[in-house]
């Protein structure tokens, strides 16, 4: 259902991009439903700091706090994940520093630690102490949720000691896990008490039971393992940008798209434009004009620059962009006031037009 | 899970056209493209072309925009690709593919007088 | 169009093996970059994006490298199960072309 007619067709691609977006994978931090989660805006020198979530502004509320530079999520949910960034706004300039929230049943990830210290969790009892199983290291096991990234190692342990010795096998979400559930297989340290899988993936998800027992007894301990996927995502643009904007007749006035993408982006900056005195085409979609768009003869795409604007000039604009995966855009308004009226603070104007998320 | 189902094979004739459907489901449809990308046999990938579902934007391989139709049906979360005038060489397997992270099982068009 | 060669367009190892396979592209594509592997009668999966990024579910055996014009993807240590042919992918511009592809067999 496509929802405008472009006056003037252009490629969605760039043919010589910019390379200044940051395209690397943010850092992850993950949380357990109902926890709290607290994360510091890594950026120096802040004057002020503003908080985004998945391109949205955000503000506090009963479980958001922001309190300087740090940001608190209260009784956080799976809604609450998502792409965050902070902004420090300066006196000269701003940067804006991204990171990934997840919020599943885990809350961190596996124990990727060597078993250098895996011999002293071999406990040897004395032979004529007959003895049920029991824990050695609980500290190694207070770890009960791990969310892990895709194709990364686990480790789970159960250090563990009885007399006579006794022997541990493990369980998948309470049934026998056996080599050939899942590709690659597991390897058993028996003498580290450790279940270790190699490449996770997401089918790899569930609860791993160690199951601990001698002729005297047996104890078990749960593990749930949550495979954290990791994909390219579509664009994602700062909030509140592009700012709406006035300026007299004759003045010049910039708009500014500020765009955080881990696949090539490409820009294009959009009006409303009039054609043979309509704005709407016979099917009734409103007419649009690519003004500017990333590639070879433009420079940097993330600013629209209009000089010597005309009241023509006013209306809304939009940026907008795309990647191979998605798009994203949002929109601006531009106020054209006669010669002799100076400019003051425009009133935000929020506009989305039908066809635009 | 993200699952992409295709519609099953099809034989034609040359200078007949095909749709081959794919049936999104598992995320939200609007937020990705979908591409086309078909196989001939023995042969290698071929990107055709993609569709945003979210407002219909389009982008085609030159080589195929004047014979493929891309359309979007949002309500059944459903993509199509329309090949028209078709000749033996677009005998293929037909791949559609939620912005090349996950792929449809795939379409074998055969064309054959 | 931005034209993809890859190479070799197929080879042969041992299983445990270091395996690399490159891919140039005509022009520089900034690290748009997509590897799959396709086994027969598969679909193609995604193994790397953005040049150097495994996929979800991708064992860590397979890496990708590169900027520019010039691309590289490395098994690590060859396993019977990646027997396939591995095809590279520019994702930065219209039309989205591929590479011919490497068929990687066992010796």
């Known amino acids: 259902r496509p929802s405008f007619s472009l006056v003037e067709d252009t490629t969605l691609e760039p043919e010589e991009p910019p390379t200044k977006y940051q395209i690397s994978q943010p850092e992850v931090y993950v949380a357990a439903p109902g926890e709290s989660l607290e994360v510091r805006c890594l950026l120096k020198d802040a004057a002020v700091i503003s908080w985004t979530k998945d391109g949205v502004h955000l503000g506090p509320n009963n479980r958001t706090v922001l309190i300087g530079e740090y940001l608190q999520i209260k009784g956080a949910t799976p809604r609450d994940s998502g792409l965050y960034a902070c902004t420090a706004s300066r006196t000269v300039d701003s940067e804006t520093w991204y990171f990934m929230v997840n919020v599943t049943d885990a809350i961190s990830s596996g124990d990727d630690e060597d078993d250098t210290d895996g011999a002293e969790d071999f406990v040897s009892e004395n032979s004529n102490n007959k003895r049920a199983p029991y824990w050695t290291n609980t500290e190694k096991m207070e770890k009960r949720l791990h969310a892990v990234p895709a194709a990364n190692t686990v480790k789970f342990r159960c250090p563990a000691g009885g007399n006579p010795m006794p022997t541990m096998r493990w369980l998948k979400n309470g049934k026998e896990f056996k080599q050939e559930h899942r590709i690659g297989g597991y390897k058993v340290r028996n003498q580290h008490w450790s279940l270790i899988m190699e490449s996770v993936v997401p089918s790899d998800k569930g609860n791993y039971t160690c199951v601990v027992e001698n002729e005297y007894g047996s104890i078990n301990h749960t593990y749930h393992l949550d495979v954290v996927e990791r994909s390219p995502h579509r664009p994602i643009l700062q909030a509140g940008l592009p700012a709406n904007a006035s300026t007299v007749v004759g003045g010049d006035v910039e708009f500014v798209c500020k765009v955080y993408s881990d696949a090539q982006p490409h820009i294009q900056w959009i009006k409303h434009v009039e054609k043979n005195g309509s704005k709407y085409g016979p099917d009734g979609l409103p007419y649009l004009k690519v003004l500017k768009h990333s590639g070879i003869n433009s420079s940097n795409a993330e600013v629209l620059a209009l000089f010597n604007v005309t009241e023509a000039d006013a209306g809304e604009y939009i940026c907008k962009v795309s990647n191979y995966i998605g798009q994203a855009n949002q929109s601006a308004w531009l106020t054209v006031l006669p010669k002799q009226q100076a400019p003051g603070r425009e009133k935000e104007i929020t506009a989305s037009p039908d066809y635009l998320e | 899970q993200v699952q992409l189902v295709q519609s099953g094979a099809e034989v034609k004739k040359p200078g007949a056209s095909v749709k081959v459907s794919c049936k999104a489901s598992?995320?939200?449809?609007?937020?990705?493209?979908i591409h086309w990308v078909r196989q001939a046999p023995g042969q290698g990938l071929e990107w055709m072309g993609a569709?945003?579902?979210?407002?219909?934007?389009?982008s085609y391989n030159q080589r195929f925009k004047v014979r493929a139709t891309l359309t979007a049906d949002t309500s059944t979360s459903t993509v199509y690709m329309e090949l028209s005038s078709l000749r033996s060489e677009d005998t293929a397997v037909y791949y559609c593919?939620?912005?090349?992270?996950?792929w449809g099982q795939g379409t074998t068009v055969t064309v054959s007088s | 169009d931005i034209q993809m060669t890859q190479s070799p367009s197929s080879l042969s190892a041992s299983v445990g093996d270091r395996v690399t396979i490159t891919c140039g592209a005509s022009?520089?594509?900034?690290?748009?970059l997509n590897w799959y592997q396709q086994k027969p009668g598969k679909a193609p999966k995604l193994l790397i994006y953005?040049?150097?990024n495994l996929a979800d579910g991708v064992p860590s055996r397979f890496s990708g490298s590169g900027s520019g014009t010039d691309y590289t993807l490395t098994i690590s240590s060859l396993q019977p199960e990646d027997v396939a042919t591995y095809y590279c992918?520019?994702?930065?511009?219209?039309?989205?072309?591929f590479g011919g592809g490497t068929k990687v067999e066992i010796k």
């Open positions: 593919a939620r912005a090349f992270t996950y």
């Open positions: 598992g995320y939200t449809f609007t937020n990705y493209y």
């Open positions: 569709i945003y579902p979210d407002n219909g934007d389009t």
């Open positions: 022009e520089n594509i900034y690290g748009a």
């Open positions: 953005g040049a150097t």
């Open positions: 992918q520019n994702v930065l511009s219209t039309p989205y072309t």
